[in-house]
């Protein structure tokens, strides 16, 4: 699997999950979130050659098409597969509020 | 929706489904398929700016991150959303066999 275990410990050039830290205030303009100040969101990057973690029948076809037509702009793309939630704390007036934000952290990628 | 109805009738530069015809023999090397000779597979292409058909909470965050950090390599990617099957005919000896290949035709795209 193209997950953090594999990708973070390798120098994989093909589609893999990469490290990305997002600062809520600086990178998103979300100044009102109290905790955390930011988080390891990660992102997916790298080419999707034929047979590399292909998602559907279509992505297999497209990767094969790309192999036969190397100059074509039609190619599978490296995108998130498994996403995890992130708990945040913010204040409503003086009252702290905890919220679980779904689909915020990339754990693995796929070629789609 | 970034589907064939909208995308094929517009000059949309952002993420949209694009026309792509795949010839089984020439483009994939699949000589054994009797019918059809090829099909309109289509493909997804175009940038994914902030708010453009974003798939998950993560893709919203990443698009916003990209807006604040324009030079970053982390950005959502335009990939298939709705896929349709394709019926094919091939021969096993003299006997024709009809098969439905799932997820073969792109009908719409999303930013993931």
């Amino acid at each position: 699997a193209l997950d953090t275990n594999y990708c973070f410990s390798s120098t994989e050039k093909n589609c893999c999950v990469r490290q990305l830290y997002i600062d809520f205030r600086k990178d998103l303009g979300w100044k009102w979130i109290h905790e955390p100040k930011g988080y390891h969101a990660n992102f997916c990057l790298g080419p999707c050659p034929y047979i590399w973690s292909l998602d559907t029948q279509y992505s297999k076809v497209l990767a094969l098409y790309n192999q036969h037509n190397p100059g074509a702009s039609a190619a599978p793309c490296c995108v998130p597969q498994a996403l995890e939630p992130l708990p945040i704390v913010y204040y409503v007036g003086r009252k702290p509020k905890v919220e679980q934000l779904s689909n915020m952290i990339v754990r693995s990628c796929k070629c789609s | 929706a970034l589907d064939t109805n909208y995308c094929f009738s517009s000059t949309e530069k952002n993420c949209c489904v694009r026309q792509l015809y795949i010839d089984f023999r020439k483009d994939l090397g699949w000589k054994w398929i009797h019918e059809p000779k090829g099909y309109h597979a289509n493909f997804c292409l175009g940038p994914c700016p902030y708010i453009w058909s974003l798939d998950t909470q993560y893709s919203k965050v990443l698009a916003l991150y990209n807006q604040h950090n324009p030079g970053a390599s982390a950005a959502p990617c335009c990939v298939p959303q709705a896929l349709e099957p394709l019926p094919i005919v091939y021969y096993v000896g003299r006997k024709p066999k009809v098969e439905q290949l799932s997820n073969m035709i792109v009908r719409s795209c999303k930013c993931s």
Partner: antibody, heavy 121, light 107 residues
Framework: EVQLVQSGAEVKKPGASVKVSCKTS????????MNWVRQAPGAGLDWMGQ????????NYNEMFEGRVTLTADTSTSTAYMELSSLRAGDIAVYYC??????????????WGQGTLVTVSS | DIVMTQTPPSLSVSPRETASISCRAS??????????MHWYLQKPGQSPQLLIY???NLESGVSDRFSGSGSGTDFTLRISRVEANDTGVYYC?????????FGQGTK
């Protein structure tokens, strides 16, 4: 230029619901909280609640007894306020107003033009 | 809930004079070194507009004839060299405690 453009005036029967829209432009919709404030004829301002459009988090004023529902459509940068079980006391101008950005509850720096809701049998 | 009381309820001022409006909160609206008090003007037939943010910070684009002061429970909005265009209803607002609340207005 930041703009908040609200839907037109509504006339509703008692017990019915009303849904007011607030179409935004000129800023990043998912960066700011959107508040809703109402003003009865000749009266002051009452805060109804707020929504963070990025993931739909809401905070409501208990005064509205669960009758108000706030939603947002990020694809069109539009916020919505639905008020149910309408009564004569709900006759008011309803405003959407963007939060200043430093806190969830905050000052409001941009306001819509207001939507008059009339309740009449 | 924090109740905001404005005085006077209405005020008539001659051009070029100074006007003062008071706002008293039922409990302190100070937290983390800030006073969570803001001032708005609602001109006839218009939506409210933000004048002063966090007790004393002038909102961009607002005339420097407007100034705010105070802390804790007592706050004041001053308008120097009053103009006819300043006519309207002035509201204070706190956001230190949920629910956010406004004063009843000073005309």
């Amino acid at each position: 230029e930041v703009q908040l453009v609200q839907s037109g005036a509504e006339v509703k029967k008692p017990g019915a619901s009303v849904k007011v829209s607030c179409k935004t432009s000129g800023y990043t919709f998912i960066t700011y909280w959107m508040n809703w404030v109402r003003q009865a004829p000749g009266a002051g301002l009452d805060w109804m609640g707020q929504i963070f459009p990025a993931w739909g988090s809401t905070n409501y004023n208990e005064m509205f007894e669960g009758r108000v529902t706030l939603t947002a459509d990020t694809s069109t940068s539009t916020a919505y306020m639905e008020l149910s079980s309408l009564r004569a006391g709900d006759i008011a101008v309803y405003y959407c107003a963007r939060g200043y950005g430093n806190y969830a509850l905050d000052a409001m720096d941009y306001w819509g033009q207001g939507t008059l809701v009339t309740v009449s049998s | 809930d924090i109740v905001m009381t404005q005085t006077p309820p209405s005020l008539s001022v001659s051009p070029r004079e100074t006007a003062s409006i008071s706002c008293r909160a039922s409990e302190s609206v100070d937290s983390y070194g800030n006073s969570f008090m803001h001032w708005y003007l609602q001109k006839p037939g218009q939506s409210p507009q933000l004048l002063i943010y966090l007790a004393s910070n002038l909102e961009s684009g607002v005339s420097d004839r407007f100034s705010g002061s105070g802390s804790g429970t007592d706050f004041t909005l001053r308008i120097s060299r009053v103009e006819a265009n300043d006519t309207g209803v002035y509201y204070c607002q706190q956001n230190d405690e949920d629910p956010l609340s406004f004063g009843q207005g000073t005309k």
